[in-house]
């Protein structure tokens, strides 16, 4: 028998990825980071 239509049995949690760059003053370049769910990971 074919299966009746149902959604997947698990919930997908979407997280916002935020790229940012912070100027730390002249001659010192910049800090580039990746924030995932509020935590800086890079």
């Amino acid at each position: 028998d074919a299966e009746f239509r149902h959604d997947s049995g698990y919930e997908v949690h979407h997280q916002k990825l935020v790229f940012f760059a912070e100027d730390v003053g002249s001659n010192k370049g910049a800090i580039i980071g990746l924030m995932v769910g509020g935590v800086v990971i890079a």
Partner: antibody, heavy 123, light 112 residues
Framework: QVTLKESGPALVKPTQTLTLTCTLS??????????VGWIRQPPGKALEWLAH???????SYNPSLKSRLTISKDTSKNQVVLTMTNMDPVDTATYYC???????????????WGQGTTVTVSS | DVVMTQSPLSLPVTPGEPASISCRSS???????????LEWYLQKPGQSPQLLIY???NRFSGVPDRFSGSGSGTDFTLKISRVEAEDVGVYYC?????????FGQGTKLEIK
């Protein structure tokens, strides 16, 4: 509040085509995940599932009756229509429509039913 | 088709006493998504069916907690911890994992 109401002829003759309408209120069939199905119950007997239609026009039929059934929807009228061809006295039953909604935050069960409409097939 | 077999077909119960209804499927009704779509409905006299339990053990909103569902694979049970007069009617199990959706033949609960 959510309601479903079935309408159609109370009496049809053998070999004729039955057309039943389910009018929905309190929710929209155009809502993602929404679906409406038809179930029937012969006098004194158990329930039998007939067909189901989804918001995206996907349809599912009981294979034993598929050749006789057509389910469709009119989103503008918020109605679902079931037609059954070549009616026979054994098709005498109360016909119900019921709501079912897909989704991880939905019940995904027949949570609201109409009051049913009784159809007698006789010459 | 998946055949749903209920027992007993008739269930006389004294108010305040527990009641149990069995529903067995002819094959597994575990969906490929990991859920088991087994539902219980009550049809009170002269009324449309009403949802009690979905996905084996989840009580629908407004359903008293004296109703509980359990089971897995092919063997399922609806239990009423203390039967009340308003619980009379016909109880149906329904599997919605496979097409066609199939109901049990019904269990008529009556008050002794």
């Amino acid at each position: 509040q959510v309601t479903l109401k079935e309408s159609g002829p109370a009496l049809v003759k053998p070999t004729q085509t039955l057309t039943l309408t389910c009018t929905l209120s309190g929710f929209s069939l155009s809502t993602s995940g929404m679906g409406v199905g038809w179930i029937r119950q012969p006098p004194g007997k158990a329930l039998e599932w007939l067909a189901h239609i989804w918001w995206d026009d996907d349809k599912s039929y009981n294979p034993s009756l598929k050749s006789r059934l057509t389910i469709s929807k009119d989103t503008s009228k918020n109605q679902v229509v079931l037609t059954m061809t070549n009616m026979d006295p054994v098709d005498t039953a109360t016909y119900y429509c019921a709501r079912r909604q897909l989704g991880l935050r939905s019940i995904d069960a027949m949570d609201y039913w109409g009051q049913g409409t009784t159809v007698t097939v006789s010459s | 088709d998946v055949v749903m077999t209920q027992s007993p077909l008739s269930l006389p119960v004294t108010p305040g006493e527990p009641a149990s209804i069995s529903c067995r499927s002819s094959q597994s009704i575990l969906h490929s998504n990991g859920n088991t779509y087994l539902e219980w409905y009550l049809q009170k006299p002269g009324q449309s069916p009403q949802l009690l339990i979905y996905k084996v053990s989840n009580r629908f909103s407004g359903v008293p907690d004296r109703f509980s569902g359990s089971g897995s694979g092919t063997d399922f049970t609806l239990k009423i911890s203390r039967v009340e007069a308003e619980d009379v009617g016909v109880y149906y199990c329904l599997q919605t994992t496979r097409v066609p959706l199939t109901f049990g033949q019904g269990t008529k609960l009556e008050i002794k």
